[in-house]
């Protein structure tokens, strides 16, 4: 129980793609403000987004120090203009949110497929090496430094002129696919982590087919 | 401090099942691939496969697939190897390692290693 | 599979001289994108586990003195001592840590004259 006039949040989500993570809750809040923590199991709880009046806060500052470890965060509601107020147990009235681990948890954002180019009967699609919030020596890493030889690229690519897909697999960012020659082929890439149970793969790249801007054509 | 302890020496038969194990500690332990390695006598490293513990998800080295079994118990931080019918050429130390932060940066933390004789 | 070969497989050098080992790799290590070779060096010491030196071929891991280099490029690298000192014995192994199944070098015998 709490302060007159104050509930609790609920529903508290994790949203995070790329490691960029933001904890959102409900409800809209009438006469209350809140207050987010967040923690790692081992670690000091540490105060963000302080007093506001949002059902979201950005938690990526925090989670991006170390994404293998798991978070817990929790939502403390207080009432507007008298913040110092307490529940009856002497505390703030606060919700839990469930734990949360970025590196096993953290959606794959939609890759994008930055240039292709037809060699004769051979075509190089390369997909862009999508960069994260995660800093090594003031440098941001890519999805590729974080997850290394787990993350997987699958190529969707098929005839213009036809609807049957046809699929190749690369652990790099880089896929060498024959094609017969005078065909244009469409292409979309998924980002995928085999290893995963849960947000395994990403959604499909936007289309680029053969004939547009992207390509390059050599005899 | 992370540490990942190995069981203690094993002398068994061969044909006979055996299961090591490596406990971590001082970190996440869900989110670091395990690593197995052998050593035999004299002989250089040879890695045998891995585990996310925080999936399950397994590779192996065809050299040892279908031989072993790797798996973890992830509410006790302990991952396994494990074989059904041993032979005398599996005589080894046998090490577990854990993967570094970053992605392929190699095996930064090393158990202390299991010696495992097979003899009749 | 990536195979990894080792030379010279016996290294004898007198403390205060350079060593320099050679590994090569039957496929490209290379990830283009991020400029990164995923070659890894270990040091095992005479009744020790193995112990992390050098990731993504030239990265010295946090602790490994700066005696130890690591170069090289695609399919050729190699791993230098500045100085050896007494401790530096033991065998050295590099490792494609590219792409499963993970695989080492055969191991060069470092070993004072």
């Known amino acids: 129980s709490g302060t007159t006039n104050t509930v609790a949040a609920y529903n508290l989500t994790w949203k995070s793609t790329n490691f960029k993570t933001i904890l959102e809750w409900e409800p809209k809040p009438v006469n209350q403000v809140y207050t987010v923590q967040i923690s790692t199991k081992s670690g000091d709880w540490k105060s963000k987004c302080f007093y506001t009046t949002d059902t979201e806060c950005d938690l990526t500052d925090e989670i991006v120090k170390d994404v293998k470890q798991t978070y817990l965060a929790r939502v403390f509601s207080y009432p507007a203009g008298n913040v110092e107020s307490t529940g009856s147990a002497g505390e703030p009235l606060y919700e839990n949110s469930p734990e949360f681990t970025p590196y096993l948890e953290t959606n794959l954002g939609q890759p994008t497929i930055q240039s292709f180019e037809q060699v004769g009967t051979k075509v190089n699609v390369t997909v862009e090496d999508e960069r994260t919030l995660v800093r090594r020596n003031n440098t941001f890493l890519s999805l590729r430094d974080v997850f290394g030889k787990d993350l997987i690229y699958t190529l969707y690519y098929w005839k213009s002129s036809s609807s049957g897909k046809k699929t190749a697999k690369t652990n790099t960012n880089e896929f060498l696919i024959d094609v017969d020659k005078g065909e244009n082929y469409c292409f979309s890439v998924q980002a995928v982590i085999p290893s995963r149970t849960v947000n395994r793969k990403s959604t499909d790249s936007p289309v680029e087919c053969m004939g547009q801007e992207k390509g390059e054509f050599r005899e | 401090e992370v540490q990942l302890v190995q069981s203690g020496a094993e002398v068994k038969k061969p044909g006979e099942s055996l299961r090591i194990s490596c406990k971590g500690s001082?970190?996440?332990?869900?989110?670091?691939?395990i690593e197995w390695v052998r050593q035999m006598p004299g002989k250089g490293l040879e890695w045998m496969g891995d585990?996310?513990?925080?999936?399950?998800?397994?590779n192996y080295s065809p050299s040892f697939q279908g031989h072993v079994t790797i798996s973890a118990d992830k509410s006790i931080s302990t991952a396994y190897l494990q074989w059904s019918s041993l032979k005398a050429s599996d005589t080894a130390m046998y090490y577990c390692?854990?993967?570094?932060?970053?992605?392929?940066?190699?095996?930064?933390?090393w158990g202390q290693g299991t010696l495992v004789t097979v003899s009749s | 599979d990536i195979v990894m070969t080792q030379t010279p497989l016996s290294l004898p050098v007198t403390p205060g001289e350079p060593a320099s080992i050679s590994c090569k790799s039957s496929?490209?290590?290379?990830?283009?994108?991020?400029?990164?070779?995923?070659l890894t060096w270990y040091l095992q010491k005479p009744g020790q586990s193995p112990q992390l030196l050098i990731y993504?071929?030239?990265t010295r891991e946090s602790g490994v003195p700066d005696r130890f280099s690591g170069s090289g490029s695609g399919t050729d690298f190699t791993l230098k001592i500045s100085r050896v000192e007494a401790e530096d014995v033991g065998v050295y192994y590099c490792?494609?840590?590219?792409?499963?199944?993970?695989?080492f070098g055969q191991g060069t015998k470092l070993e004072i004259k």
């Open positions: 390692a854990r993967s570094g932060y970053y992605g392929n940066s190699g095996f930064a933390y």
């Open positions: 001082g970190y996440t332990f869900i989110t670091y691939w």
């Open positions: 585990i996310l513990p925080g999936s399950g998800s397994t």
């Open positions: 496929q490209s290590l290379l990830y283009v994108y991020g400029q990164k070779n995923y």
């Open positions: 993504w071929a030239s």
């Open positions: 490792q494609n840590d590219f792409s499963w199944p993970l695989t």
